[in-house]
């Protein structure tokens, strides 16, 4: 088991500021937007735009807000109860299975295939074989036709931040 982390171990911006709002824990837990004090007697509010908590918790400090990477746009800012929501810029996408970075959408389909789905922040363009209608799952094709795609308009946010 790891040693207990104390407030002194935390970065200065994570330490409880004396002016932060306090309330009492309920059944040993603090509500979203708060963390518990080291002595367990108080719930201390998170700092807007700096940290957050989304659920009832017994965290010694709130979780740090995510900063959107370059290549991402901020859909909604970090609040005390919700992390930042970031989304890939137009023309790029992030797959659930490889969420580390936004990848460029392909500009067209391989020869013999037609585009049936646009580039969205969470998926590449979708290509199917002209004849069979089966999907193409390969990487960027060596030869592309002149079938081009314009970046899709996002219908809903794609967030890794929960």
């Amino acid at each position: 088991e790891s040693a207990l982390i104390t407030q002194q171990d935390l970065a200065p911006q994570q330490r409880a500021a004396p002016q932060q709002k306090r309330s009492s824990p309920s059944e040993g837990l603090c509500p979203p937007g708060h963390h518990i004090s080291e002595d367990g007697r108080d719930c201390i509010s998170c700092k807007y735009g700096q940290d957050y908590s989304t659920h009832w918790n017994d965290l010694l400090f709130c979780l740090r807000c995510t900063r959107c990477d370059s290549g991402e746009v901020e859909l909604s800012p970090c609040t005390t109860t919700r992390n930042t929501v970031c989304q890939c810029e137009e023309g790029t996408f992030r797959e659930e299975d490889s969420p580390e970075m936004c990848r460029k959408c392909r500009t067209g389909c391989p020869r013999g295939m037609v585009k049936v789905g646009d580039c969205t922040p969470w998926s590449d363009i979708e290509c199917v074989h002209k004849e069979s209608g089966t999907k193409h799952s390969g990487e960027v094709p060596a030869v592309e036709e002149t079938v081009t795609s314009s970046p899709g308009t996002p219908a809903s946010p794609c967030s890794l931040s929960g």
Epitope: S2, L59, L60, E96, D97, E100, L160, G162
Partner: nanobody, 126 residues
Framework: EVQLLESGGGEVQPGGSLRLSCAAS????????VGWFRQAPGKEREFVCA????????YYAESVKGRFTCSRDNAKNTLYLQMSSLRAEDTAVYYC???????????????????WGQGTLVTVKP
């Protein structure tokens, strides 16, 4: 390969207690947050609790607040869920899960988790 194996489920009366365990066969267990989810018949899988990698601090769903406690033993690569004051609505298959990537401090949504156990059934009935 990540393997998660839950145990400790069973039938219990309302007001009773159970302790679930989840054994992980992955070397990175001690550096990753880990969570419990549950799925009742005909319902979607829902978040129960998640605990930080070092075992200090956890998130809890409002429905289990004050009744369930999430803990872990990194030396044994094991996650625990202590359940007390059980109710009929706690009847479900309980799953432990590891996130699909390691940089989310305390993920609490199904889509953020990529590795799942096979589940253990908890039935609460008189």
């Amino acid at each position: 390969e990540v393997q998660l194996l839950e145990s400790g489920g069973g039938e219990v009366q309302p007001g009773g207690s159970l302790r679930l365990s989840c054994a992980a066969s992955v070397s990175t267990f001690g550096t990753s947050p880990v969570g419990w989810f549950r799925q009742a018949p005909g319902k979607e899988r829902e978040f129960v609790c998640a605990i930080r990698w070092e075992g200090v601090g956890a998130y809890y769903a409002e429905s289990v607040k004050g009744r369930f406690t999430c803990s872990r033993d990194n030396a044994k690569n094991t996650l625990y869920l202590q359940m007390s004051s059980l109710r009929a609505e706690d009847t479900a298959v309980y799953y432990c899960a590891l996130p699909r990537r390691g940089d989310s401090e305390l993920p609490s949504t199904v889509k953020e988790y990529g590795y799942w156990g096979q589940g253990t059934l908890v039935t609460v009935k008189p």
